[in-house]
């Protein structure tokens, strides 16, 4: 079994999250992709999921969340914005391939979002934000649920890295349709 | 423990062509994106290609484009970089390095290896 | 292409001191910047990256702060090995990844 891998980011609130997930271009460039967060004990949980088939450099926004699949690149872009510290936990990118399982990409991301000015003198991510003004156009797409009967109902242990997740739900602001979505290694 | 160990190196004429190779051990290395990252005598960090993991996709700086070819075998475990049209500005340490999984940054790298375009 | 600007070139100071080094983003890179250390004859090292977080094995005497357009990189207190070029990097977007010029920092 391939070893699972986390990279870490230690963000302040308000900051974002801008990480990019790697896939084979051939194999996945239509596919439809979604990004989860996976709480101790629970199964995968969908935040957002691109459309299906996946539109070339189409921003989907859920909430503070935004996907962008560069089909020409073979990368999903994943931006989470204005970054709370409800928001620190784990997540990884999948590829939904039905009827097959989904595929997950590597690594996952450890976030910790911490309170506390995040700038230096001069320094303002608000004046940049019109990057995240996402045009009237943009659709959220509905993320479908799989069924299997190798369900997963424990998530992975926790880093041995000097980060811990919080317990507390996260609390993404107009999220919604958030499914639960089993995902195999 | 990741190790990057970049070969190849040496003095070429200019017009004159070199292959580098980095070898790499201790992690996946089809997962993840590769970048050649050269340093002039006495001179800064200059990024020059990139090759992506999983969907091979390749970058290469404005300086380089078309003359140099970034190429990688799984199988093997290692990068290359083909320099053709040497030019005496081509003259630097070369290093290879590995990126992160979700971002092009550079969490590990080769020892380098100097190229000299001279006549 | 993203240009990025490091002040100062060279900064002088004394071990236990503190140390703080700037760069600066032709356009807004968020929060997508590293840092890097790099010793005579060696390769460079890892510091920051994410503008703020400590890559693995690095003192906490390093921290990055900053997001946008203007970051900064504080040792907080010197140590002998912490003299070195210390280099900023941009991964915002898409290719070229930039490079600041480099700052030197050298014993005062």
């Known amino acids: 079994a391939t070893k699972l891998t986390e990279e870490k980011y230690e963000l302040k609130e308000g900051q974002t999250l801008d990480v990019k997930c790697d896939y084979t271009l051939e194999k996945f460039a239509s596919s439809q992709k979604a990004w989860q967060i996976i709480r101790d004990g629970e199964m995968p949980k969908t935040l957002a999921c691109t459309e299906r088939p996946s539109k070339n450099s189409h921003p989907v926004q859920v909430g503070r969340i935004i996907l962008e699949d560069y089909h020409d690149h073979g990368l999903l872009r994943v931006r989470m914005v204005n970054l709370q510290v409800e928001d620190s936990g784990l997540y990884q990118c999948v590829i939904y391939q039905p009827p097959k399982e989904p595929h997950m990409l590597f690594d996952r991301i450890r976030l910790v979002v911490t309170k506390g000015f995040s700038g230096t003198p001069g320094s303002n991510e608000n004046s940049t934000q019109n990057v995240y003004k996402i045009p009237p156009t943009t659709t959220k797409a509905l993320c479908p649920l799989y069924t299997s009967p190798r369900t997963v109902t424990q998530a992975p242990p926790k880093s041995t890295a000097d980060v811990s997740t919080p317990d507390s739900e996260i609390n993404l602001t107009n999220v919604t349709d958030i499914i639960r979505v089993p995902v195999f290694n | 423990e990741v190790q990057l160990l970049e070969s190849g190196g040496g003095l070429v004429q200019p017009g004159g062509s070199l292959r580098l190779s980095c070898a790499v051990s201790g992690f996946t290395f089809s997962r993840y994106a590769m970048s050649w990252v050269r340093q002039a005598p006495g001179k800064g960090l200059e990024w020059v290609s990139e090759m992506r993991g999983s969907s091979g996709s390749t970058y290469y700086a404005d300086s380089v484009k078309g003359r140099f070819t970034i190429s990688r075998d799984n199988s093997k475990n290692t990068l290359y970089l083909q320099m053709n049209s040497l030019r005496v500005e081509d003259t630097a340490i070369y290093y290879c390095?590995?990126?992160?999984?979700?971002?092009?940054?550079?969490?590990?790298w080769g020892q380098g290896t100097l190229v000299t375009v001279s006549s | 292409e993203i240009v990025m600007t490091q002040s100062p070139a060279t900064l002088s100071v004394s071990p236990g001191e503190r140390a703080t080094l700037s760069c600066r983003a032709s356009q807004s890179v968020n929060s997508n910047l590293a840092w890097y250390q790099q010793k005579p004859g060696q390769a460079p090292r890892l510091l920051i990256y994410?503008?703020?977080t400590r890559a693995t094995g690095i003192p906490a005497r390093f921290s990055g702060s900053g997001s946008g357009t203007e970051f900064t990189l504080t040792i907080s207190s010197l140590q002998s090995e912490d003299f070195a070029v210390y280099y900023c990097q941009q991964f915002y977007n898409w290719p070229p990844w930039t490079f600041g010029q480099g700052t030197k920092v050298e014993i005062k």
């Open positions: 994410g503008a703020s």
């Open positions: 390095a590995k990126e992160f999984s979700s971002n092009s940054l550079f969490d590990y």
